[in-house]
Amino acid sequence: PEPPTACREKQYLINSQCCSLCQPGQKLVSDCTEFTETECLPCGESEFLDTWNRETHCHQHKYCDPNLGLRVQQKGTSETDTICTCEEGWHCTSEACESCVLHRSCSPGFGVKQIATGVSDTICEPCPVGFFSNVSSAFEKCHPWTSCETKDLVVQQAGTNKTDVVCGPQDRLRA
């Protein structure tokens, strides 16, 4: 580990003296002197600072722009930034969630492996043998082919990854 520095945790070194950092939610007004403590002021409305700091300006809360498909997931405080998420049916394009795009739909032949959230897109998977999907959907999983046998029917047309099997009546001429 790094050896300890001249000033303790939650202090900073300025002009040969250790001054207290401002606590989260407050900004620096003036450094300490030999005779006075560090002077800090609370951040204003719609501003924040999330660490012990010596910043002279607070950061502006993030704006969740509805024109970009964004909405507020968690309102910011003087110590935390606003957290944005996307409107229903949309998801963030990046971790910072600065804009949103429509959830992807899984094409016929593919089913939904994982439904999209506000921060992640739909994950599709190809329908394996025995399963199909005949729609473009952001919710539908691959469905199993119909089991003709359980209905006392026989397969008249084989299923594919996009179509179900077609069942028909048993051939009565067979013993």
Epitope: P3, P4, T5, A6, C7, R8, L13, I14, N15, S16, Q17, C18, T33, E34
Partner: antibody, heavy 116, light 107 residues
Framework: QVQLVQSGAEVKKPGSSVKVSCKAS????????IEWVRQAPGQGLEWIGV????????NYNEKIKDRATLTADKSTSTAYMELSSLRSEDTAVYYC?????????WGQGTLVTVSS | DIQLTQSPSSLSASVGDRVTITCRAS??????LNWYQQKPGKTIKLLLN???RLHSGVPSRFSGSGSGTDFTFTISSLQPEDIATYYC?????????FGGGTKVEIK
């Protein structure tokens, strides 16, 4: 009144070490940083490092970091600067100074001569 | 490292003259600039800290001004006892650095 009294002049061989002391009086030793500065003959001032006598934590000038060690003994209100692997270019007057909004009070200086 | 350029490196003035020394920083150091006096065979003394604050016991003929990168040190009326070398020093960012010094002499 604030006083910083340093140890006497030293003559050292290249490759050896020197330890300069700085005894503080007239104030609460743990409440102020102690800075160390040197001045080669006919040259300007060069900062060596700073120590917090209260915590023992320190910062160093990268140029000299690997060879300088700053310590402080609260029981005797004395700060120390040790410099190892001495070379001729380390010949200088070494000063301690009290911090607190600049180097507010200085010791009288200790001449260290490095010569074979 | 922050460089401090002090000028002039030396000057000669008469007793009673107004003497001005400048110190320029290579980057913004706000008001974290200190001025020191070094007389031969004497302890170095802090004259001004935070660019313009007179240290205790320092005569009022010494003054300082400036902020950011450009600073000025002034002796309003030079006295024989002011013969010395003067240094500026920044306390904004480690490593602390000094100007090259200005040697003041009497004409």
């Amino acid at each position: 009144q604030v006083q910083l009294v340093q140890s006497g002049a030293e003559v050292k061989k290249p490759g050896s070490s020197v330890k300069v002391s700085c005894k503080a009086s007239g104030y609460a030793f743990s409440d102020y940083l102690i800075e160390w500065v040197r001045q080669a003959p006919g040259q300007g001032l060069e900062w060596i490092g700073v120590i917090n006598p209260g915590s023992g934590g320190s910062n160093y000038n990268e140029k000299i970091k690997d060879r300088a060690t700053l310590t402080a003994d609260k029981s005797t209100s004395t700060a120390y600067m040790e410099l190892s692997s001495l070379r001729s270019e380390d010949t200088a007057v070494y000063y301690c100074a009290r911090g607190g909004g600049g180097f507010t009070y200085w010791g009288q200086g200790t001449l260290v001569t490095v010569s074979s | 490292d922050i460089q401090l350029t002090q000028s002039p490196s030396s000057l000669s003035a008469s007793v009673g003259d107004r003497v001005t020394i400048t110190c320029r920083a290579s980057q913004d150091i706000s008001n974290y600039l200190n001025w020191y006096q070094q007389k031969p065979g004497k302890t170095i003394k802090l004259l001004l800290n935070f660019a313009s604050r007179l240290h205790s016991g320092v005569p009022s003929r010494f003054s300082g001004s400036g902020s950011g990168t450009d600073f000025t040190f002034t002796i309003s009326s030079l006295q024989p006892e002011d013969i010395a070398t003067y240094y500026c020093q920044q306390g904004s960012t480690l490593p602390w650095t000094f100007g090259g010094g200005t040697k003041v002499e009497i004409k």
